[in-house]
């Protein structure tokens, strides 16, 4: 099937440093099919960064992005 051949973005691991919030443009949560949970932040320079959804700063950024959407 087409869906089976379309790679899903997952995280091998997570950044170990908090990204400055003003660098972040958007985010998405990785699929439940991934072996570990993840939040992928898109920076204003179009770089994607894997982050740990259990970390407080990650949850705050996600909440703030949702509020500003």
């Amino acid at each position: 099937s087409l869906a089976a051949d379309t790679p899903t973005a997952c995280c091998f691991s997570y950044t170990s440093r908090q990204i400055p919030q003003n660098f972040i443009a958007d985010y998405f949560e990785t699929s439940s099919q991934c072996s570990k949970p993840g939040v992928i932040f898109l920076t204003k320079r179009s770089r994607q960064v894997c982050a740990d959804p259990s970390e407080e700063w990650v949850q705050k950024y996600v909440s703030d992005l949702e509020l500003s959407a």
Epitope: A4, D5, P7, S13, Y14, T15, I40, Q48, V49, C50
Partner: antibody, heavy 120, light 109 residues
């Protein structure tokens, strides 16, 4: 620009240990993993292991008992230590940058390698 | 540990399309193996070309593409150039470790 450079002893006696340092520039170890790969003379590549930003590691199960990967983020250095070397550990040893997202190239930039010969 | 198999050597001509494949002895290669392709040029120069099955690294020419064909991962070079002569290694992810194939020596003449 992104650069990785390996430095090692060159010659190691059988049964001794090997220590190699990978010094990186142009990116931070807090945002990327570092993989170690080796290539015996005239042969293919063998993945040894990886250290992730938080210090977690994955290893080649066949070599896990002899391998240790560590790092010093402040010095932008990653260290490979391998114990009990034998002649078939003779190889070029490489470090490579490892992005964290599965849809990216997982070993995108490579060092030039350091040659290790195991001989008495 | 899994064994990953590639063609040992292939020959093509400039402008032709050539496909290199990567097979796993554990079953069909899937998108969860995150197939990667690495190019080795003389003097131990390695470059990551393709990641996550089909994503080109920045700066890699569009003639290089990755896919799944049947039960294998594939690297297709559409319109091969003489500078594409190299050894190509695939690597597959198995839950917590990578395994490389033996490499394909591609000759372009």
């Amino acid at each position: 620009q992104v650069q990785l450079k390996e430095s090692g002893p060159g010659l190691v006696a059988p049964s001794q240990s090997l220590s190699i340092t990978c010094t990186v520039s142009g990116f931070s170890l807090t945002g990327y993993g570092i993989h170690w790969v080796r290539q015996p003379p005239g042969k293919g590549l063998e993945w040894l292991g990886v250290i992730w930003p938080g210090g977690g590691t994955n290893y080649n199960s066949a070599l896990m008992s002899r391998l240790n990967i560590s790092k010093d983020n402040s010095k932008s250095q990653v260290f490979l230590k391998m114990n009990s070397l034998q002649t078939d550990d003779t190889a070029m040893y490489y470090c490579a940058r490892g992005p964290l997202i599965t849809t990216e190239v997982s070993m995108d930039y490579w060092g030039q390698g350091t040659s290790v010969t195991v001989s008495s | 540990q899994a064994v990953v198999t590639q063609e040992s050597a292939l020959t093509t001509s400039p402008g032709e399309t050539v496909t290199l494949t990567c097979r796993s002895n554990t079953g069909a290669v899937t998108t969860s193996n995150y197939a990667n392709w690495v190019q080795e040029k003389p003097d131990h120069l390695f470059t990551g070309l393709i990641g996550g099955t089909n994503n080109r690294a920045p700066g890699v020419p569009a003639r290089f593409s990755g896919s799944l064909i049947g039960d294998k991962a594939a690297l297709t070079i559409t319109g091969a150039q003489t500078e594409d002569e190299a050894i190509y290694f695939c690597a597959l992810w198995y839950s917590n470790h990578w395994v490389f194939g033996g490499g394909t020596k591609l000759t372009v003449l």
